[in-house]
């Protein structure tokens, strides 16, 4: 398949990845679908350096990332290992809080106003960040 060698219009390149920052809010699943329709995924934070980059662009606004525990354990949407990977939770988070009164706990992770992470109700309409890697082969089947 073809490889993406430069970022699409309105995306920001950083360390061989492309990032797109929303200006509106969606529920986590709708944000995830939006990124996938762009052949991308919700942002996966793998280092303190990447955390700082994303934080700089989103500012002090609740923003979804590609991390959830809707099926049990915490998982990154691109398969990056959660247990051994970078984490930046707020103290005492994630807490799967049930006290919000919206039903269920909290299964989706977002950047908070100070950049650290919190788990929250996935239906909340937060902004989001899409990410796609440069030089990654597309999903198209090879030409025969």
């Amino acid at each position: 398949g073809s490889e993406r060698t430069c970022c699409p219009v309105n995306w920001v390149e950083h360390e061989r990845s492309c990032y797109w920052f929303s200006r509106s809010g969606k529920a986590w699943a709708d944000a995830d679908n939006y990124c996938r329709l762009e052949d991308a995924h919700l942002v996966v934070v793998t280092s303190w350096e990447e955390q700082k980059f994303v934080q700089h662009h989103i500012g002090p606004v609740n923003t979804w990332m590609g991390l959830h525990d809707q099926n049990g354990p915490w998982k990154w949407v691109d398969g990056t290992d959660y247990e051994t990977g970078f984490k930046n939770w707020r103290p005492e988070q994630p807490d799967d809080w049930y006290g919000h009164g919206l039903g269920g706990g909290e299964d989706c992770a977002h950047f908070t106003d100070d950049g650290r992470w919190n788990d929250d109700v996935c239906q909340r309409p937060y902004r989001w960040v899409c990410e796609t890697e440069l030089d990654k082969a597309s999903q198209e089947p090879p030409l025969l």
């Epitope: 398949g1 073809s2 699409p8 309105n10 929303s22 200006r23 509106s24 809010g25 969606k26 529920a27 699943a29 709708d30 679908n33 939006y34 996938r36 329709l37 762009e38 052949d39 309409p125 597309s138 999903q139 198209e140």
Partner: antibody, heavy 123, light 107 residues
């Protein structure tokens, strides 16, 4: 000028299969998600499926999930819809439609449509 | 799934009339709504996206408004070529859903 031209419709028996094609021109095909939307005779519009520009992500309406498969060949600027286990209720005009892109965060709306191809499922 | 309803289902009007069609979503969709016009035997044509943004080439007599669950499309002065069926569509989440349509015909 953007153009979308569907083909492959026709009469098929219940349980049969059909493959629709949509030839695109006038835009960078691989940069846009593409969709199929259908319209039963005398009825309204029903979204069927969408595929991302690179082909890596697909979504389907519940009514066709497991029976229909959307795909694309960006080297040929062509969109496909493989329809299996067809039912009478699949009878419709099938439109190929291009995802609009406004720079906003709309998930999926359609700024260009083909003329449609009629699929009739009947014994 | 998000259900879309439209009212009225049909409206009879004369050239020069102002016509307003309402679309309602079963849950909030912000402003992720599009409107299409369809004439018999033809493909739909995009008129408005993001609830109020006019698609290029669409006459300024068409306008859209609304946010959340309630939306409208208005035609300020109906022209002969505007007699058609109008559909709303939510662009917020999958599955994408359309309203049942509103037919605008000649009084």
């Amino acid at each position: 000028e953007v153009q979308l031209l569907e083909s492959g419709g026709g009469l098929v028996q219940p349980g049969g299969s059909l493959r629709l094609s949509c030839a695109a021109s006038g835009f960078t095909f691989s940069s846009y998600a593409m969709s199929w939307v259908r319209q039963a005779p005398g009825k309204g519009l029903e979204w069927v499926s969408v595929i991302s520009g690179g082909g890596g992500s697909t979504y389907y309406a519940d009514s066709v999930k497991g029976r229909f498969t959307i795909s694309r060949d960006n080297s040929k600027n062509t969109l496909y819809l493989q329809m299996n286990s067809l039912r009478a209720e699949d009878t419709a005009v099938y439109y190929c439609a291009k995802r609009g892109y406004s720079g906003y965060e709309d998930l999926l709306y359609f700024d260009c449509w083909g003329q449609g191809t009629l699929v009739t499922v009947s014994s | 799934d998000i259900q879309m309803t439209q009212s009225p289902s049909s409206v009879s009007a004369s050239v020069g009339d102002r016509v307003t069609i309402t679309c309602r979503a079963s849950q909030g969709i912000s402003n992720w709504l599009a409107w299409y016009q369809q004439k018999p035997g033809k493909a739909p044509k995009l008129l408005i996206y993001t609830a109020s943004s006019l698609q290029g080439g669409v006459p300024s007599r068409f306008s859209g408004s609304g946010s959340g669950t309630d939306f409208t499309i208005s035609i300020s002065s109906l022209q002969p070529e505007d007699f058609a069926t109008y559909y709303c569509q939510q662009a917020n989440s999958f599955p994408i859903t359309f309203g049942p349509g509103t037919k605008v015909d000649i009084k």
